[in-house]
């Protein structure tokens, strides 16, 4: 399906609004430090050029690839070398090396200030004064902070952002209407970004085989009534969409995602009974709805898997004839019967089954050898079940904040070399699994918890890859995608770690502590807790609890004092001395 002009083709397919939005996202994800106005200028230039190509596909340069056009445009930025350093070297390369060079320089933790939310009236004025600029600024600010955000989904978030302002800026109580909506968009956006980051990491580090296996398992759980051929078709199309988005081909990605939504809605009968309500919605909402759709009901009459995959004499013959297809069918059949399993567990079972066949199909009596293969699955299933049970019990006992603290201590002891901000961020997010998953019925707990943990641990892996400090983290992150969570769970106290020297400055606090939000206070305390464990990795739970309780009391006391700063100056050193004594 070749076109004389790729840029004209995409402009016509997507329409001007989506075209401009996606180009802005692409540029913002590549050049994360460039000012908004610079990006808007580049986007306008690209858009004007695209329009000339729509008018005449044979016009000069219209036959160039999108990577060539976009890369040439990015490489015109005057301050590239000063702002981005070695990323400027990408511009000396030819396509396709240049694009992949830009991709490799995407920064998962850009040095950008946290977004500050202005007063509601200020935001509403800005929205009314120039709605288009206001929404572009949203796309830009999110995209530059989340360089792997799923671009077509970001357009959906921007549409919801616009709708929130349109509704709430006319409400009697603007803040009461708007703020909860913005909080929800922020939280959903962070979750969406993290989920997409795992997809891109999977494709980049482990390849499309790993992604396809994940997609077969997940789609088979969602669409258990669909035939294997139907699931395979959806997996192939979905892999193409995510490969394109993760490769920076955002226009193609959005176009193909729209085609996939169209296909699914035209073929609902052979996919799932749950798609109806999604298919009546407009494009962005429809695609989002389809991606989030609940699992369909399992067919009532599914036979036992053992007949085809254990008892049959043809297992080795079928496996040898087409290994990938046979394992894909096994994964499909197992996943559609087990919506109660995490995708990662299903992939581990498929891996175990493959390993057994590799061994047994070369044995003297293959059937005898693989006859008990399903029994070998039991410990693999019980491990995450027990983990979820224990951690949910702990969460219910402690509540979210203290559960996070328990995880902070646990993970700091496992990998104390990791930076404190990363340990705090990751452990806080690991701790959110409790509120997210533990309230769910038993059958939904494991898929919720383990697949969420995979997303959070991927964040640890991408941050660690940027600044590697721990061989244990590198090993867990790179050896096996499906075994990352068990690998981290299995880590014990790092005996080789040399405790960090005590630094009083780390435990010195000031009156500004009192004006922080509850969340910011928690982060301060949790930062101190990590530093404490790095200083005394063998401290007991009781010792750490005592110090943290004293810390909370000390902060509360000083924040109630008339002269807060004087209190912190006087009580701080006492707290430090008492803590050192308690941990000696």
């Amino acid at each position: 399906d070749t076109h004389k002009s790729e840029v004209a083709h995409r402009f016509k397919d997507l329409g001007e609004e989506h075209f401009k939005g996606l180009v802005l996202v692409a540029f913002s994800q590549y050049l994360q430090q460039c000012p908004f106005e610079e990006h808007v200028k580049l986007v306008n230039e690209v858009t004007e050029f695209a329009k000339t190509c729509v008018a005449d596909e044979s016009a000069e340069n219209c036959d160039k690839s999108l990577h060539t056009l976009f890369g040439d445009k990015l490489c015109t930025v005057a301050t590239l070398r000063e702002t981005y350093g070695e990323m400027a070297d990408c511009c000396a390369k030819q396509e396709p090396e240049r694009n992949e060079c830009f991709l490799q320089h995407k920064d998962d933790n850009p040095n950008l200030p946290p977004l500050v939310r202005p007063e509601v009236d200020v935001m509403c004025t800005a929205f009314h004064d120039n709605e288009a600029t206001f929404l572009k600024k949203y796309l830009y600010e999110v995209a530059r902070r989340h360089p792997y955000f799923y671009a077509p989904e970001l357009l959906f978030f921007a549409a919801r952002y616009k709708a929130a302002f349109a509704e709430c800026c006319q409400a009697a109580d603007k803040a009461a209407c708007l703020l909860p909506k913005l909080d929800e968009l922020r939280d959903e956006g962070k979750a969406s970004s993290a989920k997409q980051r795992l997809k891109c990491a999977s494709l980049q580090k482990f390849g499309d085989r790993a992604f396809k296996a994940w997609a077969v398992a997940r789609l088979s759980q969602k669409f258990p009534k669909a035939e294997f051929a139907e699931v395979s078709k959806l997996v192939t199309d979905l892999t193409k969409v995510h490969t394109e988005c993760c490769h920076g081909d955002l226009l193609e990605c959005a176009d193909d995602r729209a085609d996939l939504a169209k296909y699914m809605c035209e073929n609902q009968d052979s996919i799932s009974s749950k798609l109806k309500e999604c298919c009546d919605k407009p494009l962005l909402e429809k695609s989002h709805c389809l991606a989030e759709v609940e699992n369909d009901e399992m067919p009532a009459d599914l036979p036992s898997l053992a007949a085809d995959y254990v008892e049959s004499k043809d297992v080795c013959k079928n496996y040898a004839e087409a290994k990938d297809v046979f394992l894909g069918m096994f994964l499909y059949e197992y996943a559609r019967r087990h919506p109660d399993y995490s995708v990662m567990l299903l992939l581990r079972l498929a891996k175990a089954y493959e390993a057994t066949l590799e061994k047994c199909c070369a044995a003297a009596d293959p059937h005898e050898c693989y006859a008990k293969v399903f029994d070998e699955f039991q410990p693999l299933v019980e491990e995450p079940q027990n983990l979820v049970k224990q951690n949910c019990e702990l969460f219910e006992q402690l509540g979210e904040y203290k559960f996070q603290n328990a995880l902070l201590v646990r993970y700091t002891k496992k990998v104390p070399q990791v930076s404190t901000p990363t340990l705090v961020e990751v452990s806080r997010n690991l701790g959110k699994v409790g509120a997210k998953c533990c309230k769910l019925p038993e059958a939904k707990r494991m898929p919720c918890a383990e697949d969420y943990l995979s997303v959070v641990l991927n964040r640890l892996c991408v941050l660690h890859e940027k600044t590697p400090v721990s061989e244990k983290v590198t090993k867990c992150c790179t050896e096996s995608l499906v075994n990352r969570r068990p690998c981290f769970s299995a880590l014990e106290l790092d005996e080789a770690y040399v405790p960090k020297a005590f630094n009083a400055e780390t435990f010195t606090f000031h009156a500004d502590m009192c004006t922080l939000s509850e969340k910011e206070k928690q982060v301060k305390k949790q930062t101190a807790l990590v530093e404490l464990v790095k200083h005394k990795p063998k401290a007991t739970k009781e010792q750490l609890k005592g110090v943290m309780d004293n810390f909370a009391a000390f902060v509360e006391k000083c924040c109630k004092a008339d002269d807060k700063e004087a209190c912190f100056a006087e009580e701080g050193p006492k707290f430090v001395a008492a803590s050192q004594a308690a941990l000696a």
């Epitope: 396709p96 090396e97 992949e100 991709l103 490799q104 494709l203 980049q204 580090k205 482990f206 390849g207 499309d208 085989r209 790993a210 490969t243 993760c246 490769h247 990938d324």
Partner: nanobody, 124 residues
Framework: QVQLVESGGGLVQAGGSLRLSCAAS????????MAWFRQAPGKEREFVAH???????TYLDSVKGRFTISRDNAKNTVYLQMNGLRLEDTAVYYC??????????????????WGQGTQVTVSS
């Protein structure tokens, strides 16, 4: 362990042609993505061409229209037909296989297996 063996290199005049071959030792080759890279003296290794396991291809801009990558899964072999050779094409050419099929095709760390290389020299 997959082994890749390149052949077909040699000395050729500018404007001439060569066909490089890369034979793989395993049947799993048919499900791997394959690529050719090259390294000229004193320069870093450079991507040349890539062929997806299903057959789609990607080329370095400067070789587009001159080089063609292809594969014969029955023979476990990937080829690089090089026409219109230029002096700047002089380099050691390496064959690489990516059994996982990663998406960054121009990046050498995406490949699990490498051949030993075959020298291509273009003279005036």
């Amino acid at each position: 362990q997959v082994q890749l063996v390149e052949s077909g290199g040699g000395l050729v005049q500018a404007g001439g042609s060569l066909r490089l071959s890369c034979a793989a030792s395993e049947r799993a080759f048919s499900h791997s993505n394959m690529a050719w890279f090259r390294q000229a003296p004193g320069k870093e290794r450079e991507f040349v061409a890539h062929i997806h396991w299903r057959g789609s291809t990607t080329y370095l801009d400067s070789v587009k229209g001159r080089f063609t990558i292809s594969r014969d899964n029955a023979k476990n072999t990937v080829y690089l037909q090089m026409n219109g050779l230029r002096l700047e094409d002089t380099a050691v050419y390496y064959c690489a296989a990516d059994s996982a099929r990663r998406i960054l095709v121009t990046v050498s760390t995406s490949y699990d297996y490498w051949g030993q290389g075959t020298q291509v020299t273009v003279s005036s």
